[in-house]
């Protein structure tokens, strides 16, 4: 029961992750103009990844898309980069991770099947909530250095009689969805990791053998115990990993194919 | 065609209040802010201010802080100017103008003050 | 507050004659976002509401006869009739439309001869 909720869990944080990060990427205001030194401009710009807006007195908002790729700076081309890798990744994840909930059954699927589609869904939902935050986070620091280069310069006179302010760009909105929807997607991502753990295939249904031991009888009917009875509440039950029998202490010091989280 | 209808002539005593509607039509009137723009008699024009009709938001030139108080209807597509404690000095024609760079005004409300 | 200084305050001109108008601002009305300049020009006939000539410094308003043309950058700026015309003689204004509040210049008076 818990590794069905820790998996669907997960597959829901990453579904708003990756929502999230088309949204960001999408958005038109990744910098916003800095009002700091004019605060009663009439006309407001901002940037996102495809286009740069202008935003007039009219209340009028004029968008211009970047109709150049050879044109446009290299960070912005590998943030806009990292962001498509980061949705496809999270969208093949997604896709992935539908067929590896344990809550639907599709065909004779194996659990061994299930748990390696969800490990394989949570990697795919962590590099692509990395890619997020790495290519929001590059954004971010570009901002930062241009925001330093053009307070430095920050008045170009004509003669030191009219005073130019130049337009400088701070934070937008999509960089804080951007890295919100990463963090999602990453913890998402590693929701269903351990949620795989979980998943190990369970034994098939052996009719129960009698072990004779001396003094008394003890019937014993092997059968792997269910993730939901939790870690360490029943370390005396073994559990089939792979084929061989180990105690759950020794599941967890030695990995197994599904023990990356 | 946009088109904007300003309510008619005003004729107001000194301390009064006066309230000029324009009525808004042939567009979205949330897509674009309502100016107010005053034009006394022989002279240049001054900017008032503006009102947002899609989230309520308002900027005014601070000359007219206190002054003017622009408010809007947005069922009616009717933006509103009310002008408070009128004076000879504010006897002028008053204008609303929208679209962009003012690409529409309308034919303007004169307000007289007089005793 | 941006002021917007128009010269000269009055121009006698004869119909068919070229005429020039300027206008200067105490900032630069240029904006690096899109590399316009927010000056726009107003023609006013007595007992009209001004009329949008042109914008971002030197774009016309659809409607609006070829013999108008706006010019300049940053502060200095001119509005030119190429041939002036009987229906032309009016009130010009410039006005600031980058920083709040909107400023207008005090206009140019057109009068005929």
């Known amino acids: 029961m818990a590794v069905t909720a820790c998996q669907g869990l997960g597959f829901v944080v990453s579904l708003i992750g990756i929502a999230g990060i088309i949204a960001a990427t999408c958005m038109d205001q990744w910098s916003t103009q800095d009002l700091y030194n004019n605060p009663v401009t009439a006309v407001f710009n901002y940037q996102g990844l495809w286009r740069s807006c202008v935003r007039e007195s009219s209340g009028f908002t004029e968008c211009r898309g970047y109709f150049t790729l050879l044109g446009l700076p290299a960070m912005l081309q590998a943030v806009r980069a990292l962001m498509i890798v980061g949705i496809v990744l999270g969208a093949i994840g997604l896709l992935v991770s539908i067929f590896a909930l344990k809550c639907i059954r599709i065909g004779s699927m194996e659990d061994s099947a299930k748990a390696n589609m969800t490990l394989t869904s949570g990697i795919m939902f962590i590099v692509s909530g990395l890619c997020a935050i790495a290519g929001v986070s590059v954004f971010a620091n570009m901002l930062v250095t241009n925001f330093w280069m053009s307070t430095a310069n920050m008045y170009t006179g004509m003669g030191g009689m009219v005073q130019t302010v130049q337009t400088r760009y701070t934070f937008g909105a999509a960089l804080f969805v951007g890295w919100v929807a990463g963090g999602l997607t990453l913890i998402g991502g590693v929701m269903m990791c351990i949620a795989c753990r979980g998943l190990a295939p369970e034994e098939t249904n052996y009719k129960a053998v009698s072990y004779h031991a001396s003094g008394h009888s003890v019937a014993y009917k092997p059968g792997g115990f269910k993730a939901s009875t939790g870690f360490g509440s029943n370390t005396k039950n073994k559990k089939i990993y792979d084929g061989g029998a180990r105690t759950e202490d020794e599941v967890q010091s030695y990995p197994s194919k599904h023990d990356y989280v | 065609e946009i088109q904007l209808q300003q309510s008619g002539p005003e004729l107001m005593k000194p301390g009064a209040s006066v309230k000029i509607s324009c009525k808004a039509s042939?567009?979205?009137?949330?897509?674009?802010?309502m100016h107010w723009v005053k034009q006394s008699h022989g002279k240049s024009l001054e900017w008032i201010g503006y009102?947002?009709?899609?989230?309520?938001?308002?900027n005014y030139n601070q000359k007219f802080k206190g002054k003017a108080t622009l408010t809007a209807d947005k069922s009616s597509s009717t933006a509103y100017m009310h002008l408070s404690s009128l004076t000879s000095e504010d006897s002028a024609v008053y204008y609303c103008?929208?679209?962009?760079?003012?690409?529409?005004w309308g034919a303007g409300t004169t307000v007289t003050v007089s005793s | 507050d941006i002021v917007m200084t128009q010269s000269p305050s009055s121009l006698t001109v004869t119909a068919g004659e070229k005429v020039t108008m300027s206008c200067k601002s105490s900032?630069?009305?240029?904006?690096?976002?899109?590399?316009?300049?927010?000056l726009t020009w107003y023609q006013q006939k007595p007992g009209q509401p001004p009329k949008l000539l042109i914008y971002?410094?030197?774009t016309r308003e659809s409607g609006v006869p070829d013999r108008f043309t706006g010019s300049g950058s940053g502060t200095d700026f001119t509005l030119t009739i190429s041939s002036v015309q009987a229906e032309d003689l009016a009130v010009y204004y410039c006005?600031?439309?980058?920083?709040?509040?909107?400023?207008f210049g005090a206009g140019t008076k057109l009068e005929l001869k």
């Open positions: 042939g567009y979205s009137f949330t897509s674009y802010y």
């Open positions: 009102f947002d009709p899609y989230n309520g938001g308002t």
């Open positions: 971002w410094a030197s």
């Open positions: 103008a929208c679209y962009r760079f003012f690409a529409v």
């Open positions: 900032q630069s009305l240029l904006n690096s976002g899109n590399q316009k300049n927010y």
């Open positions: 006005q600031n439309d980058y920083s709040y509040p909107l400023t």
